[in-house]
């Protein structure tokens, strides 16, 4: 029950996380114009991974995509790549995890197969979350570097007011969405990996058997060994096959002609 809950919760958390990563990747507000110590303007600038926007004080907004691919900064391309890889891995992970869910029966899929699929999806979610966190962090680092570079290039403007030569940009909403989403995907992945351990079937418990050799009056029962060593924790001894060897319980329940002289 706990395994099913852990797996289900891991799936839901990862699903929310990946939805967040997609949302962050599509959002325009990765960097927003820093309004602190800025000359009062009627316009506000903000940029995303795919386009840049200008918003008027009236609310009217105009956006333009980055049409050139070669002219874009390498860092921006790297962030785009990390986010896309994160989305793709997350989407594949979700697909795999749907079939791995314990509450869903697909044909005669064994628990070992479900455990493997759960582990695979968990690893995919972890990598997906890490990609998103890395992408957002690289972009944030780029913003911080540019912010302090523009701050260093200051000049004294009219009225003795200190101004920057370039407009400074600060963290946009997409960065926070990306960090949270990446974290959720990562947590979901860890939960899936934990659930996998519970799904994996334990090693086969070999039943204690009585070997009956005709002509001998004493049956060899290795039950004492089982009890003393702690092996064979399985209490439900099921009848596996009929033959010369029988389970301990069977021998005790059904005496044979070899048991007594």
């Amino acid at each position: 029950m706990a395994v099913t809950a852990c797996q289900g919760l891991g799936f839901v958390v990862s699903l929310i996380g990946i939805a967040g990563i997609i949302a962050a990747t599509c959002m325009d507000q990765w960097s927003t114009q820093d309004l602190y110590n800025n000359p009062v303007t009627a316009v506000f600038n903000y940029q995303g991974l795919w386009r840049s926007c200008v918003r008027e004080s009236s609310g009217f907004t105009e956006c333009r995509g980055y049409f050139t691919l070669l002219g874009l900064p390498a860092m921006l391309q790297a962030v785009r790549a990390l986010m896309i890889v994160g989305i793709v891995l997350g989407a594949i992970g979700l697909l795999v995890s749907i079939f791995a869910l314990k509450c869903i029966r697909i044909g005669s899929m064994e628990d070992s197969a479900k455990a493997n699929m759960t582990l695979t999806s968990g690893i995919m979610f972890i990598v997906s979350g890490l990609c998103a966190i890395a992408g957002v962090s690289v972009f944030a680092n780029m913003l911080v570097t540019n912010f302090w570079m523009s701050t260093a290039n200051m000049y004294t403007g009219m009225g003795g007011m200190v101004q920057t030569v370039q407009t400074r940009y600060t963290f946009g909403a997409a960065l926070f969405v990306g960090w949270v989403a990446g974290g959720l995907t990562l947590i979901g992945g860890v939960m899936m990996c934990i659930a996998c351990r519970g799904l994996a079937p334990e090693e086969t418990n070999y039943k204690a058997v009585s070997y009956h050799a005709s002509g001998h009056s004493v049956a060899y029962k290795p039950g004492g060994f089982k009890a003393s060593t702690g092996f064979g924790s399985n209490t439900k001894n099921k009848k596996i096959y009929d033959g010369g060897a029988r389970t301990e319980d069977e021998v005790q329940s059904y005496p044979s002609k070899h048991d007594y002289v």
Epitope: T41, S52, V54, F60, E62, R64, Y66, S150, T164, T167
Partner: nanobody
Framework: QVQLVESGGGLVQPGGSLRLSCAAS????????MGWFRQAPGKGLEFVAG????????DYADSVKGRFTIARDNAKNTLYLQMNSLRAEDAAVYYC????????????????WGQGTQVTVSS
């Protein structure tokens, strides 16, 4: 990279009008935010007006608001600045500038610049 050439400057009387043009060499003119800056003798660069890619948003310095109008014709790859009710303090070298992603009043944000055109306001 885009090359910008200004024209239309000259001598004008106070209260007069003048229309500046800025021709861009690049056919990707529509993918640039454009701006006009001016520099009076012994002064720094001052933002005059700016316009977004398709001309939907325009920004003006308080000193020129209501007197100057910025416009662009993407089909002709040309930027315009219509200057009315000119004053003596409007006399300066006017520069056309371009940048790809932001409409700002800071000269450091503009990557491409023209050589400038002189505007003299005198009676």
């Amino acid at each position: 990279q885009v090359q910008l050439v200004e024209s239309g400057g000259g001598l004008v009387q106070p209260g007069g009008s003048l229309r500046l043009s800025c021709a861009a060499s690049d056919s990707t003119f529509s993918s640039y935010i454009m701006g006009w800056f001016r520099q009076a003798p012994g002064k720094g660069l001052e933002f005059v007006a700016g316009i977004t890619w398709s001309g939907g948003i325009k920004d003006y310095a308080d000193s020129v608001k209501g007197r100057f109008t910025i416009a662009r014709d993407n089909a002709k790859n040309t930027l315009y600045l219509q200057m009315n009710s000119l004053r003596a303090e409007d006399a300066a070298v006017y520069y056309c500038a371009a940048n790809a992603i932001q409409l700002t009043r800071r000269s450091g944000d503009y990557a491409y610049w023209g050589q400038g055109t002189q505007v003299t306001v005198s009676s």
